[in-house]
């Protein structure tokens, strides 16, 4: 029950996170005009990954797209790439995790297969979240650098520029949405990985050792102490625990997920 809850919660948290990453990527307010020194301004500038906008005091808004790829800063391109990779990985992760959910039955899918898929989606969510956090952090770092550079320019009059028209940009709403969304996706991914451990078929810590006495086949099982005597080749050693019976062969044919973690 706890496993199902953990898996379900991980899925929902990741879903919210990926929706947030998509929203942040599409938002125009990645950087907003710093109004600290100029609180009363006729126009308010803000920029996104895809276009920049001007909102006039009356509310009229005009946005201009970044139609070119070549003229854009490499950092902006990198942020775009990170966010898109995050969205793609997250979307694939969501698709995989839907089929991995314990509450959804698809044919005769084994628990081990669901465990595999849960781990895969979990890892995808983790990478997706990291991509989003990295993308937003790179953009934030770029803003901080530019902010202090433009502040220095304002007070030193560097390069004979007209300082009165210098527009400084600060963190926009999209950055906070991106950070939170990335964090949620990351948490969702971790929860999926935790759920995967509970989904994996359980195994005893000891391998069964058979001691063959002359004439009779006797299997001594440490822990279970259920000896099975039999004549001929039709005899199979059974490992009995947790109310379920499986042959040793069957158990060994499905490696535990713990082997990979």
């Amino acid at each position: 029950m706890a496993v199902t809850a953990c898996q379900g919660l991980g899925f929902v948290v990741s879903l919210i996170g990926i929706a947030g990453i998509i929203a942040a990527t599409c938002m125009d307010q990645w950087s907003t005009q710093d109004l600290y020194n100029n609180p009363v301004t006729a126009v308010f500038n803000y920029q996104g990954l895809w276009r920049s906008c001007v909102r006039e005091s009356s509310g009229f808004t005009e946005c201009r797209g970044y139609f070119t790829l070549l003229g854009l800063p490499a950092m902006l391109q990198a942020v775009r790439a990170l966010m898109i990779v995050g969205i793609v990985l997250g979307a694939i992760g969501l698709l995989v995790s839907i089929f991995a959910l314990k509450c959804i039955r698809i044919g005769s899918m084994e628990d081990s297969a669901k465990a595999n898929m849960t781990l895969t989606s979990g890892i995808m969510f983790i990478v997706s979240g990291l991509c989003a956090i990295a993308g937003v952090s790179v953009f934030a770092n770029m803003l901080v650098t530019n902010f202090w550079m433009s502040t220095a320019n304002m007070y030193t009059g560097m390069g004979g520029m007209v300082q009165t028209v210098q527009t400084r940009y600060t963190f926009g709403a999209a950055l906070f949405v991106g950070w939170v969304a990335g964090g949620l996706t990351l948490i969702g991914g971790v929860m999926m990985c935790i759920a995967c451990r509970g989904l994996a078929p359980e195994e005893t810590n000891y391998k069964a050792v058979s001691y063959h006495a002359s004439g009779h086949s006797v299997a001594y099982k440490p822990g279970g102490f259920k000896a099975s005597t039999g004549f001929g080749s039709n005899t199979k050693n059974k490992k009995i625990y947790d109310g379920g019976a499986r042959t040793e062969d069957e158990v060994q044919s499905y490696p535990s997920k713990h082997d990979y973690v």
Epitope: S52, V54, F60, F67, G71, V162, V165
Partner: antibody
Framework: QVQLVQSGAEVKKPGASVKVSCKAS????????MHWVRQAPGQGLEWMGI????????SYAQKFQGRVTMTRDTSTSTVYMELSSLRSEDTAVYYC?????????????WGQGTLVTVSS | DIVMTQSPLSLPVTPGEPASISCRSS???????????LDWYLQKPGQSPQLLIY???NRASGVPDRFSGSGSGTDFTLKISRVEAEDVGVYYC????????FGQGTKVEIK
């Protein structure tokens, strides 16, 4: 083809108001901004303001703030420009011009102009 | 507001000869998207203005290739490779950022 047809010439007294219309045809009305530009006799072009026909939001040049009102009627694809408290220096030809709301922002089509004469 | 300054204000030309008009802005018109938001318009006598050049250097549809625009940032130029009689009128540069402003205009007339 794209056409912007403006209303006829007007003669007004100082202090009165004038409302000039601009009927658009040949394109999707809500996909393009509409500007108003005026030209006093023997003078250059002067930008007055802009309206987004899609939502009706407007932006006016500082000089005309409080005196100009731009509206639109999507059912008839018509934009209106009303200028109040008319003065003799408002005597000019008033043009409407459309610009793309997405790409170039340049005014690619212009109306034929409406002459507004303010005289006592 | 951005101030647009055109020169010369009057340009007498000889048909077949080249002509050049300059336009300078008080602030850079180079947008963060890599485009220069400057347009050139021609207003022929008794007519409405017509778009010649947009985004600094792109010819509008139907505009003869003898017209070309160049420049970036704050300095722009409109060139007519071979002036024809029909090119007479007043040429205006206009910046497409907020709020829009026009240059004073350059009157081109035949000598």
């Amino acid at each position: 083809q794209v056409q912007l047809v403006q209303s006829g010439a007007e003669v007004k007294k100082p202090g009165a108001s004038v409302k000039v219309s601009c009927k658009a045809s040949g394109y999707t009305f809500t996909s393009y901004y509409m500007h108003w530009v005026r030209q006093a006799p023997g003078q250059g072009l002067e930008w007055m303001g802009i309206i987004n026909p899609s939502g009706g939001s407007t932006s006016y040049a500082q000089k005309f703030q409080g005196r100009v009102t731009m509206t639109r009627d999507t059912s008839t694809s018509t934009v209106y420009m009303e200028l109040s408290s008319l003065r003799s220096e408002d005597t000019a030809v008033y043009y409407c011009a459309r610009s793309s709301a997405y790409g170039t922002y340049s005014m690619d089509y212009w109306g034929q102009g409406t002459l507004v004469t303010v005289s006592s | 507001d951005i101030v647009m300054t055109q020169s010369p204000l009057s340009l007498p030309v000889t048909p077949g000869e080249p002509a050049s008009i300059s336009c300078r802005s008080s602030q850079s018109l180079l947008h963060s998207n890599g485009y220069n938001y400057l347009d050139w318009y021609l207003q022929k006598p008794g007519q409405s203005p017509q778009l010649l050049i947009y985004l600094g250097s792109n010819r509008a549809s139907g505009v003869p290739d003898r017209f070309s625009g160049s420049g970036s940032g704050t300095d722009f130029t409109l060139k007519i490779s071979r002036v024809e009689a029909e090119d007479v009128g007043v040429y205006y540069c206009m910046q497409d950022l907020w709020p829009r402003t026009f240059g004073q205009g350059t009157k081109v007339e035949i000598k």
